[in-house]
Interface confidence: medium
């Protein structure tokens, strides 16, 4: 329209009016029910993981155990906030818990996201060192897999999630009866730059919390795969008749994390790209409507790991069985065998067979033929 032109015929409907956004309708109790289920399974499952890790003797713990424990701690601290989010969603986005819990529970979501992905990166790198460079990096692994690496990843996760703690607030928007828990950029941005802040934080969280860690992990697994492939070509081991899947639990953890968080990051990225590429309104609306479900799927990841351990790792299953019947006299005899292998210690899935240097079925396993057997997950 011309600068001095009359805009009498202009009815006020802006370009976005074709994009007729409406209040997002939650699917009743579906999302709150999933949140409560994740809370129940997550607290018991991750509590069990921590119990089995810390119950084992120090000597039995391997370098990866600290990452497994950290992963469980991250998930556990997050899932305890899920009843709050379930209530919020069920009340059609009315937050009754005050600003402190709005900030804290929002913060824990992102701390969990960062800490989890960093733990998986740590596990992957640990496996890389154990398999690709077992001798050269023995000392490095002792140092890296210790308290320093864990402290660094937690500090990093805590710092990266800090904008959420600062910017989250509760607001009685429009002075209606409902109070929302939302990101308020007004303290750091002008109205015109709020979107830039939202995009900036969104892109950085996806980059640092997903893209970069997964690039590192894929690189680690590429070299691991090369090493394992070369190893199987060169050697035939009596104890590995069925070519047991090495590293399966960590690979499954990583793949599960990727599958759970991919929709969240993908939809978020596509939505942000929409401001540049101007998606059709229907697609924009589709992204807005599926995002809560993508968020829900990402939260589900926090209760899955214990089930993955239970499914893929006999050692963890044994630890669980031990705990379930530890108070019963009939189990007293089975909880400790002469070899010490039935102590129900959960060594992050580093199965060493039924006994020291034993393959499946108890057959003798020569360590020289697979030097990293002590440190690698060997699962049927």
């Amino acid at each position: 329209m011309e600068e001095g032109g009359d805009f009498d015929n202009y009815y006020g409907a802006d370009n976005q009016s074709e994009c007729e956004y409406t209040d997002w309708k939650s699917s009743g109790a579906l999302i709150p029910a999933i949140y409560m289920l994740v809370f129940l399974l997550g607290t018991t499952g991750n509590g069990l993981v921590l119990w089995t890790v810390f119950r084992s003797s120090r000597e039995k713990r391997r370098s990866a155990d600290i990452f497994i424990a950290s992963l469980a701690v991250a998930d556990l601290t997050f899932v305890v906030t899920l009843p709050l989010w379930a209530t919020y969603t069920y009340r059609d986005y009315d937050w009754p818990f005050g600003t402190f819990f709005c900030k804290l529970s929002s913060y824990l979501i992102f701390v969990n996201m960062y800490a989890s992905v960093f733990c998986l990166t740590g596990l992957s790198f640990d496996r890389y060192l154990a398999i690709v460079r077992p001798v050269a990096n023995a000392r490095l692994r002792l140092r890296v897999s210790g308290a320093v690496a864990t402290a660094v990843l937690w500090v990093l996760a805590a710092l990266l999630a800090m904008p959420v703690m600062v910017l989250r607030t509760t607001g009685d928007l429009e002075n209606t009866t409902k109070v929302q828990c939302y990101m308020d950029y007004s303290m750091v941005a002008t109205v015109s730059s709020e979107w830039a802040w939202e995009v900036g934080l969104g892109v950085s969280s996806t980059t640092v919390g997903f893209v970069v860690p997964f690039t590192i992990m894929l690189t680690c697994y590429f070299f691991i795969a090369q090493t394992i492939a070369g190893h199987f070509r060169k050697e035939r081991i009596e104890g590995l008749r069925k070519r047991r899947r090495l590293l399966s639990i960590i690979v499954v953890l990583v793949v599960t994390f990727a599958l759970c968080w991919m929709p969240y990051h993908l939809v978020k990225t596509l939505y942000m790209l929409g401001s540049l590429l101007h998606w059709p309104c229907d697609f924009d609306l589709f992204l807005m409507n599926i995002f809560p479900y993508c968020t829900c799927i990402s939260y589900v990841n926090s209760c899955l790991n214990p089930f993955l351990y239970a499914f893929f790792d006999p050692r963890f299953r044994q630890a669980c069985t031990s705990m379930l019947c530890c108070g019963q006299s009939r189990c007293a005899g089975t909880s400790h065998s002469s070899s010490g292998e039935k102590s129900a210690s959960y060594s992050s899935g580093h199965s060493q067979g039924p006994g020291p240097n034993m393959g499946k079925g108890g057959e003798q396993m020569h360590e020289k033929s697979i030097p990293y057997s002590q440190e690698t997950l060997v699962v049927d």
Epitope: Y11, G12, A13, D14, S17, E20, Y21, T22, D23, W24, S26, Y88, T89, D92, Y93, D94, D172, L173, E174, N175, T176, K178, Q180, C181, Y182, M183, S186, T190, V191, S192, E198, K268, Y271, L287, M288, F291, P292
Partner: antibody, heavy 129, light 107 residues
Framework: EVQLVESGGGLVQPGGSLRLSCVAS????????MSWVRQAPGKGLEWVAN????????YYVDSVKGRFTISRGDAKNSLYLQMKSLRAEDTAVYFC??????????????????????WGQGTTVTVSS | DIQMTQSPSSLSASVGDRVTITCRAS??????LGWYQQRPGKAPKRLIY???SLQTGVPSRFSGSGSGTEFTLTISGLQPDDFATYYC?????????FGQGTKVEIR
Amino acid sequence: EVQLVESGGGLVQPGGSLRLSCVASGFTFNNYWMSWVRQAPGKGLEWVANIKQDGSERYYVDSVKGRFTISRGDAKNSLYLQMKSLRAEDTAVYFCARDRFGYSFYDKGVRYYYGMDVWGQGTTVTVSS
Amino acid sequence: DIQMTQSPSSLSASVGDRVTITCRASQGIRNDLGWYQQRPGKAPKRLIYAASSLQTGVPSRFSGSGSGTEFTLTISGLQPDDFATYYCLQHNSYPRTFGQGTKVEIR
């Protein structure tokens, strides 16, 4: 063309009732909040009431609470204002307007009001004995 | 209720002039404010929303600024079409309230 057309205005005695209608066209009516705004002769604008898409939320200015009822008939693309116990001070031109909201992508339940972007031409209500 | 005080209530200006209208809120309303133009006998039109965002199709000579309690509408280079009454509207809380209006007249 996006359009709102009001009707139902007229002369009514104090204490009487009147029902205003507003028919929407050119947009998906049931996707929007809608408002009524009035303007007394020679005076400024006064927001009267608004209603959510599904009718689950309705807000009124204090001076009309208990007397006016805002409602909508999505099948007919219509907005209504039922006015009872009318007073002389209710004399005004009544405009219906479309409310424009932005919605937070991250924080569901959070909406940002962007004002009334489409207005009708108004219907005149005169309360006089 | 939040009171909106507009100043001046009327002003005289010439074509090409720069005009500034102020709106004060009785309490902080963040950026929850819009500006409307109304010509005699016509329906109001939205010019600015969210304090500073220009409505699509509105000439760029109109601009809005402010946050909290003080807001301004600026018309840089007044055109003949711009002689009208301007209202601010707060939508931070219910009931929504308009300023009393500023009438811009030809000098």
